[in-house]
């Protein structure tokens, strides 16, 4: 079917970064300034992808392949192919329609995106806050109480922090 | 295409006002937030102000609360920064930008900007 198809359609011989021109008895015509096409036997060429304003270009468009944008300092990517920018906070805030705001008592972020996330209650494993939490930081559990008590032969190692979370994207 | 074309920028003094618009086409302007953004030279992209897709929703970074106002004309597809009292630390290239359809919970994110319009405030 293939071969039939290649003889029957000389379109399909035009190979990524051209297009089968109509206008000119389907002749492979390249694709003109500031578009692209990546695959073969295309009748058109696709528009650019252009990176302004929020977006600055990570990789310039080819006739064979789109722009690449990502997001300008100050803002991080969200979406497929960075589809949309999203501005950072700073650590212990997280982002509102209202900018970026504290976390509140309780809560805390560790990355500049994201959510505020309730520091890790230690009593649920029956373990001892060793280190309080911040805006910043999650707690650190520490020893049950039972293994500090008096006579207790030995110390548990702190449990590790856990793993950051992201926001809903 | 979806457009957003910002005008308005200039030189002004300090204290001065200066009100930017931004043309919008290509998509349903009443349906998404706005938002205007920032970037003073030799620095990021700062947030400044964003507002609802009806007007009823408006918010500021700290720094130009009080001294300017975002508004929107849907009618008309055009966003608006109402600059008083500028300073010299609002020199910067102005953008306009699209936001969301639904803020409710989901991100702050935008989508498509313009090319930016410049502001300089100096005496």
């Known amino acids: 079917f293939e071969r039939t198809r290649s003889l029957q359609d000389p379109c399909s011989n035009c190979p990524a970064g051209t297009f089968c021109d109509n206008n000119r008895n389907q002749i492979c015509s390249p694709c003109p300034p500031n578009s692209f096409s990546s695959a073969g036997g295309q009748r058109t060429c696709d528009i650019c992808r252009q990176c302004k304003g929020v977006f600055r270009t990570r990789k310039e468009c080819s006739s064979t392949s789109n722009a690449e944008c990502d997001c300008t300092p100050g803002f991080h990517c969200l979406g497929a192919g960075c589809s949309m920018c999203e501005q950072d906070c700073k650590q212990g805030q997280e982002l509102t329609k209202k900018g970026c705001k504290d976390c509140c008592f309780g809560t805390f972020n560790d990355q500049k995106r994201g959510i505020c996330r309730p520091w890790t209650n230690c009593s649920l494993d029956g373990k001892s806050v060793l280190v309080n939490g911040t805006k910043e930081r999650d707690v650190v559990c520490g020893p049950s109480p039972a293994d500090l008590s008096p006579g207790a032969s030995s110390v548990t190692p702190p449990a590790p922090a856990r793993e950051p979370g992201h926001s809903p994207q | 295409e979806v457009q957003l074309v910002e005008s308005g920028g200039g030189l002004v003094q300090p204290g001065g006002s200066l009100r930017l618009s931004c043309a919008a086409s290509?998509?349903?302007?009443?349906k998404y937030w706005m938002i205007w953004v920032r970037q003073a030279p030799e620095k990021g992209l700062e947030w400044?102000?964003?507002?609802?897709?009806?007007?009823?929703?408006?918010y500021y970074v700290d720094s130009v609360e009080g001294r300017f106002t975002i508004s929107r004309d849907n009618v008309n597809n055009s966003l608006y920064l109402q600059m008083n009292s500028l300073r010299a630390e609002d020199t910067a290239v102005y953008y306009c930008?699209?936001?969301?359809?639904?803020?409710?919970?989901?991100?702050?994110?935008?989508?498509?900007s313009g090319q930016g319009t410049t502001v300089t405030v100096s005496s």
């Open positions: 930008a699209r936001g969301g359809d639904d803020y409710s919970n989901s991100h702050y994110g935008m989508d498509v």
């Open positions: 400044v102000a964003n507002i609802n897709q009806d007007g009823s929703e408006k």
């Open positions: 290509g998509f349903t302007f009443s």
